[in-house]
Amino acid sequence: LTCLGGFASPGPVPPSTALRELIEELVNITQNQKAPLCNGSMVWSINLTAGMYCAALESLINVSGCSAIEKTQRMLSGFCPHKVSAGQFSSLHVRDTKIEVAQFVKDLLLHLKKLFREGQFN
């Protein structure tokens, strides 16, 4: 969580603030979901480890025409230190496992909440 400053704000943003904004956006997506998210599009599952922000973006960037996750894609790009384009894959992808975007978002949300708690209390 060391490279989160300066994202989604005019000035430098403390890492916890940036992480909190991303979590809030994922909460909004899960709560406001009526029809299947992104028409049930499938994405590569990722390992939720150190480089997961770039890996998450690499997975989600391959979903096009889904306005519900556009803000999340933009936010993740602020968390990832390098440029990510469609078709790019890192070693963090579980390349034999695809899951629905809705499940991907839920898994990511749970993990980010855990990271947020750890950051608060440690």
């Epitope: 909440k113 855990k114 708690r117 750890e118 608060q120 209390f121 440690n122």
Partner: antibody, heavy 120, light 107 residues
Framework: EVQLVQSGAEVKKPGATVKISCKVS????????MHWVQQAPGKGLEWMGG????????ASNQKFKGRVTITADKSTDTAYMELSSLRSEDTAVYYC?????FGGGPFAYWGQGTLVTVSS | DIQMTQSPSSLSASVGDRVTITCKAS??????LSWFQQKPGKAPKSLIY???RLVDGVPSRFSGSGSGQDYTLTISSLDPEDFATYYC?????????FGGGTKVEIK
């Protein structure tokens, strides 16, 4: 149904230590942060500190000058708050409270309270 | 530490009245604010979180608003069971801090 059940009332002498328990049911213990709140007779609410039950990491209010120790036992889904060097001003009801920071707030659920009386 | 200034400290109202309680933070708390109701001898009960989101099961006559440093709890039409003490809480940063409370009494 979420329940936070606290241990019973305590009477302590000045200088002693009290340890209160808070047993959780109805949700996964490690999913939510747990906090402790003090309420002196006829007074308002004061945050004492909190813990991430997953990691055991804590945060506490400097007002209590290191007298507060908060712990969590994942094997029993129970949180504990220990207050040492008790003085008469510590006579109060102590509440445990927890919740999802992003879905209801960190103080969504409350225990019934534990009255601690400090008297010589 | 962030100070939470709650006003009024007490008020008298009648059943059916519209009641407004305010909390002012000493700095921007990014809408990380909750409201609680407490009755004598009971634990506080959560009403509102994130400044304006109603907790499940809480009557719709309760509403929260505000942003930045200024927040409001409104009871649109006071019910007999609403006579109690109300507290705000900021959870934007540690140490979390409560307002001093507002006692709503029967006129």
């Amino acid at each position: 149904e979420v329940q936070l059940v606290q241990s019973g009332a305590e009477v302590k002498k000045p200088g002693a230590t009290v340890k209160i328990s808070c047993k959780v049911s109805g949700y996964t213990f490690t999913d939510y942060e747990m906090h402790w709140v003090q309420q002196a007779p006829g007074k308002g609410l004061e945050w004492m500190g909190g813990i991430d039950p997953e990691t055991g990491g804590t945060a506490s209010n400097q007002k209590f000058k290191g007298r507060v120790t908060i712990t969590a036992d994942k094997s029993t889904d129970t949180a504990y708050m220990e207050l040492s060097s008790l003085r008469s001003e510590d006579t109060a009801v102590y509440y445990c409270t927890s919740g999802d920071y992003f879905g209801g707030g960190p103080f969504a659920y409350w225990g019934q309270g534990t009255l601690v009386t400090v008297s010589s | 530490d962030i100070q939470m200034t709650q006003s009024p400290s007490s008020l008298s109202a009648s059943v059916g009245d519209r009641v407004t309680i305010t909390c002012k933070a000493s700095q921007d708390i990014n809408s990380y604010l909750s409201w609680f109701q407490q009755k004598p001898g009971k634990a506080p009960k959560s009403l509102i979180y994130r400044a304006n989101r109603l907790v499940d099961g809480v009557p719709s006559r309760f509403s929260g608003s505000g942003s930045g440093q200024d927040y409001t709890l409104t009871i649109s039409s006071l019910d007999p069971e609403d006579f109690a003490t109300y507290y705000c809480l900021q959870y934007d940063e540690f140490p979390y801090t409560f307002g001093g409370g507002t006692k709503v009494e029967i006129k």
